[in-house]
Each structure stands twice: as structure tokens, then as C-alpha cells.
């Protein structure tokens, strides 16, 4: 029977700069029941605080709700593991909420084949930003990426859409059924997961772009 091994805070993520969650990996348990607690202070502060919510983020997590989240502060946090034989502490992690944003995927992806009379046909897609992100505040610039592939293909074709919420693709294989997905990321932060796939059947008479 031993004191617990050193835990590690391995990830902090925020969906929108208004809340965030951090997760840790326990070290070895030393063969005894082990309690974990996360403490933090904000840079420039010496008041030590305890994790306000160990439930919302699941096991081995600390969730900071709206009232605990400040974009303008760096959080300095540490996890303490304690059993009957002693304690161990994780390294301190410095967290700036601005840099840990991982949005939800974009919403309402719609895909259509457009066949104008005077131009080459194309695939047109549009989507909406995730609901938790308020782009009107100016705090966010969201960038988008699209990927698509024929249903049975292994490789995805990826296109960067910048800040646009619509996109055209000209080069497609006629008669194929395509999967299309979109994801987003803030200018500082992480890519969201890909949106659920939208399927589109490309007509057999679709004319390939030269």
C-alpha cells in the first residue's frame, strides 16, 4: 500500500468562452481508495479556490460554469490525489479560456446539386454556426472546413471555407452518392468534431468541370 501516483490534468476545453471543463488522469491508486480534488487560483490572485462542479464533466473532471469563467484571467490549477498513505499533486496547469475553445459542430448542413443553364453544375452547401457561439459580440471569428467523399471511397477531399457559411464544389463524380461534413474552429482554439454526415446523390448527367 502506497500513496497515490501523480495525477495529470491533460485537457481543458470550452464550447464558447463562457464555460469550460478540465479533465485529469489519475496516477496509480497505491492500492487504496483515493480522493481527488482540483484547486485553482487566477493569475494575480492568492485566494485558492476549489473546483465548483465535479459532476457535469463526468469522472475526473472539473466544470466551471458561467459565473466561474472569466475570459480575461489565466487560471492556475492543480489536482491533489489523497489516500490513507499520503498525497500527491499534479503539475500546475495554466489555462487561458481564450485558447481552449472547442466549439460544437456547425448545424443545419444542407447540400444541393445546382445545375444552372448557363454555367457548369456544382454542389452547393450551407450551414449555420453552433448555437452556443455568439458571433455578434465580435469575440469570435469562426473558420470552417468541409470534407466530402463518395460513399465507398476511403479518402476524404477537404476544402477550407474560411469564415463563409456556404461553399461551392465543382469537381464531382457523376452518379456517385457523396457524404459531406463540416467542422469549425475559432481563430485561437481547436477544431470541433465533424457535423453528422449529409448524403447527396450526384446525378449521372452531372458534367465534370474541365
Amino acid at each position: 500500500q502506497l500513496p497515490p501516483g501523480k495525477p495529470e490534468i491533460f485537457k481543458c476545453r470550452s464550447p464558447n468562452k463562457e464555460t469550460f471543463t478540465c479533465w485529469w488522469r489519475p496516477g496509480t491508486d497505491g492500492g487504496l481508495p483515493t480522493n481527488y480534488s482540483l484547486t485553482y487560483h487566477r493569475e494575480g490572485e492568492t485566494l485558492m479556490h476549489e473546483c465548483p462542479d465535479y459532476i457535469t464533466g463526468g469522472p475526473n473532471s472539473c466544470h466551471f460554469g458561467k459565473q466561474y469563467t472569466s475570459m480575461w484571467r489565466t487560471y492556475v490549477m492543480m489536482v491533489n490525489a489523497t489516500n490513507q498513505m499520503g498525497s500527491s499533486f499534479s503539475d500546475e496547469l495554466y489555462v487561458d479560456v481564450t485558447y481552449i475553445v472547442q466549439p460544437d459542430p456547425p448545424l443545419e448542413l444542407t447540400v444541393e446539386v445546382k445545375q444552372p443553364e448557363d454555367r457548369k453544375p456544382y454542389l452547393w452547401m450551407k450551414w449555420s454556426p453552433p448555437t452556443l457561439i455568439d458571433l455578434k459580440t465580435g469575440w469570435f471569428t469562426l473558420l470552417y472546413e468541409i470534407r466530402l467523399k463518395p460513399e465507398k471511397a476511403a479518402e476524404w477531399e477537404t476544402h477550407f471555407a474560411g469564415q463563409q457559411t456556404e461553399f461551392k464544389i465543382l469537381s464531382l463524380h457523376p452518379g456517385q452518392k457523396y457524404l459531406v461534413q463540416v467542422r469549425c474552429k475559432p481563430d485561437h482554439g481547436y477544431w470541433s468534431a465533424w457535423s453528422p454526415a449529409t448524403f447527396i446523390q450526384i446525378p449521372s448527367d452531372f458534367i465534370m468541370n474541365d
Epitope: 490572485e45 465548483p52 459565473q67
Partner: antibody
Framework: EVQLVESGGDLVQPGESLRLSCTAS????????MNWVRQAPGKGLEWVSY????????YYVDSVKGRFTISRDNAKKSLYLQMNSLRADDTALYYC???????????WGQGTMVTVSS | DIQMTQSPSSLSASVGDRVTITCRAS??????LAWFQQKPGKVPELLIS???TLQSGVPSRFSGSGSGTYFTLTISSLQPEDIATYYC?????????FGGGTKVEIK
Amino acid sequence: EVQLVESGGDLVQPGESLRLSCTASGFTFNSYEMNWVRQAPGKGLEWVSYISSSGGTKYYVDSVKGRFTISRDNAKKSLYLQMNSLRADDTALYYCARLNGVDVFDIWGQGTMVTVSS
Amino acid sequence: DIQMTQSPSSLSASVGDRVTITCRASQDIFNYLAWFQQKPGKVPELLISAASTLQSGVPSRFSGSGSGTYFTLTISSLQPEDIATYYCQRYNSAPLTFGGGTKVEIK
């Protein structure tokens, strides 16, 4: 409605003890850090003591260290201040105050009066 | 311990006047500063946090500024209901010190 209600204030003699209570309602008490702040008659505000959400961390102003003890019972949604060896200069209206998530006193009780006099 | 010095300790101004109260910290407290209003016989109320963030429901004639060691609370156009004592308070470390207060009266 978010509310804090203090009780336990009284007239006591120097050297005596008193226990103040503060009962919370309308919010998740065990998620918030709590404080006692006092105000002597006709004077300004003075922070007295802080307690973290689980009760593991406590701070005191120098003038009450070793005499006052802050505690909480999250199951009862209650905050306490045990005041021993009371002195005349402890005479004040004692407020309990909630510290919000970014460390500001956002909710205050109405206060309970402690008078220390012989 | 960090001391908070407020000035003036009292002031008298006319309705509509611009009123400025200052608060100095004896050491750098970044912008960990709050302002409270306490009306006679009432409980203190939070006006401003983080030196300049107006709390919801507080009239826009109140504003806060400053960082480091020097802070101000400004009432752009004094109203009769603003008669109160105003306190600054730092909250970056214990003790969570208040300034001595500024009593605002109407001429």
C-alpha cells in the same frame, strides 16, 4: 429568490462567546464560497473571514485570528461564525456575504448585531 | 497587507454634477477591484466588478476605470437616489480589504 438570513447576534460581555448563523436559500449553497463582513456603528465595512465551498480553506482578518472560527454545513445550507474572547471593538453589524464565481460579494444578508459591552 | 485608500472621505455635489471618487491600492492589484454602494440603513450593493464591469441593473451613469494601483468610480450625472456611501474593495488575496468609504451628499 436568492437570500441570506443571519441570526445569533446579541449583547454580551467582554470575554464571552457567541455563535452567528447564516441560512441560505434560492441557490446551490455548496457551490459558493462564503464570507463574514462586519460594520461597526457609523464606520466602514471590514471583511472578517472567508470559507471555501467545501470548508477546506479558511482565511481571517488579523484582528480575529485565534478568536473567531468560520465553518459551514452544506447539508443545512448554513454558514457559522464562532466568536470567542469577544472584545468591545468586535461590536458591529455582522453580514454574511456570498462570493460569486469571480470572487466578488454579490449577495449580502441583512446583518445581525453583536454588541460587546460590560 | 495591501491597504486601500479612498478619497475624498465625503463630498457634497449638486444634482446633475459629475462626481469622481478615487481608490488607491498600496500594491498592484491588477483589476481585482469592486465598488459597492451602501444607502443609509441598507445593505451594501455591488455596483462594479473587475474595476470597470457594471453589474446588471446598475444605471449607466455609474462607471469604473483603472488598473494596478489607481481606480476611479464616476457618477456622470448625480441623482438624488445616489445619496450613499461608496466603498472600493480588492479581492485578489486575503484580507479582502475595503477602502474607508466616501459619503456622497446632495448640496
